[in-house]
């Protein structure tokens, strides 16, 4: 088997310019691949939509922390 995993690169070229209410968010993914033009966060909403956001924005970091805490508390 291969020694390292090849994953298709997903990049964010534009980010949302408004806050998404936390109750609409389901999960997130960090985008840090240097082949992408900027570091970003992809939020997945409860309706299944994926939205790019800027992790430098306070609401984005707060949403990430909130989701981290939710998922941590779901663990047995």
């Amino acid at each position: 088997q291969p020694d390292s995993v090849s994953i298709p690169i997903t990049c964010c070229f534009n980010v949302i310019n408004r806050k998404i209410p936390i109750q609409r968010l389901e999960s997130y993914t960090r985008i840090t691949n240097i082949q992408c033009p900027k570091e970003a966060v992809i939020f997945k909403t409860k309706r299944g939509k994926e939205v790019c956001a800027d992790p430098k924005e306070r609401w984005v970091r707060d949403s990430m922390k909130h989701l981290d805490q939710i998922f941590q508390n779901l663990k047995p």
């Epitope: 240097i34 033009p37 900027k38 570091e39 981290d68 805490q69 998922f71």
Partner: antibody, heavy 117, light 107 residues
Framework: QVQLVQSGAEVKKPGSSVKVSCKAS????????MHWVRQAPGQGLEWIGR????????KFDPKFQGRATITADTSTSTAYMELSSLRSEDTAVYYC??????????WGQGTTVTVSS | DIQMTQSPSSLSASVGDRVTITCKAT??????LAWYQQKPGKAPKLLIS???SLETGVPSRFSGSGSGTDYTLTISSLQPEDFATYYC?????????FGGGTKVEIK
């Protein structure tokens, strides 16, 4: 690809200041945070602080607050870290690194700062 | 500040061995943990972020696990190029803090 190239080694007297530079290529530093981490000889890693080059906002470990200054020049894609009132315990390798999320995926090669009378 | 305690501080192992390094935080860090590998005279290299997410290009013999305050880095089959010092780092809250390091030496 991303490269962070730091300035050369420095030898300083106790009580003086040192300013280390970190020039980025392959990325727009406005899109990230630039961090500074140091490592004393034979010791572990210690986070000093970071800057958001887009607006100049900085955050420091309280241990370095008031003694460290981090700046960035977006026109040259260069970040700087200045440490004042140097003492022998500041002898270390100083690294710049990038990362919005608080972990560091690209690092400079390191700058050795020796504080000696 | 969140303190990170890494153990062991050093270990001796042979090529092919399974190696486990642990990291304990003084409070819940919600999987905001990174692992780095550092070789003498070189800058650290990011291996894992988010406790389990392997960086692109990092061999699959490296894996991360854990939650809450307790985290583990495992090397499933140690290779000659893996002899190095490994550090954990929490990025849940600033100031970001590192464990003291684990030096993996050849037995």
């Amino acid at each position: 690809q991303v490269q962070l190239v730091q300035s050369g080694a420095e030898v300083k007297k106790p009580g003086s200041s040192v300013k280390v530079s970190c020039k980025a290529s392959g990325l727009n530093i406005k899109d990230t945070y630039m961090h500074w981490v140091r490592q004393a000889p034979g010791q572990g890693l210690e986070w000093i602080g970071r800057i958001d080059p887009a607006n100049g906002n900085t955050k420091f470990d309280p241990k370095f607050q008031g003694r460290a200054t981090i700046t960035a020049d977006t026109s040259t894609s260069t970040a700087y870290m200045e440490l004042s009132s140097l003492r022998s315990e500041d002898t270390a390798v100083y690294y710049c690194a990038r990362g919005v999320f608080g972990f560091f995926d690209y690092w400079g090669q390191g700058t050795t700062v020796t504080v000696s009378s | 500040d969140i303190q990170m305690t890494q153990s062991p501080s050093s270990l001796s192992a042979s090529v092919g061995d399974r190696v486990t390094i642990t990291c304990k935080a003084t409070e819940d860090i919600y999987n905001r943990l990174a692992w780095y590998q550092q070789k003498p005279g070189k800058a650290p290299k990011l291996l894992i972020s988010g406790a389990t997410s392997l960086e692109t290009g990092v061999p699959s013999r490296f894996s991360g696990s854990g939650s809450g305050t307790d985290y583990t880095l495992t090397i499933s089959s140690l290779q000659p190029e893996d002899f190095a010092t490994y550090y954990c780092q929490q990025f849940w809250s600033a100031p970001y803090t590192f464990g003291g390091g684990t030096k993996v030496e050849i037995k």
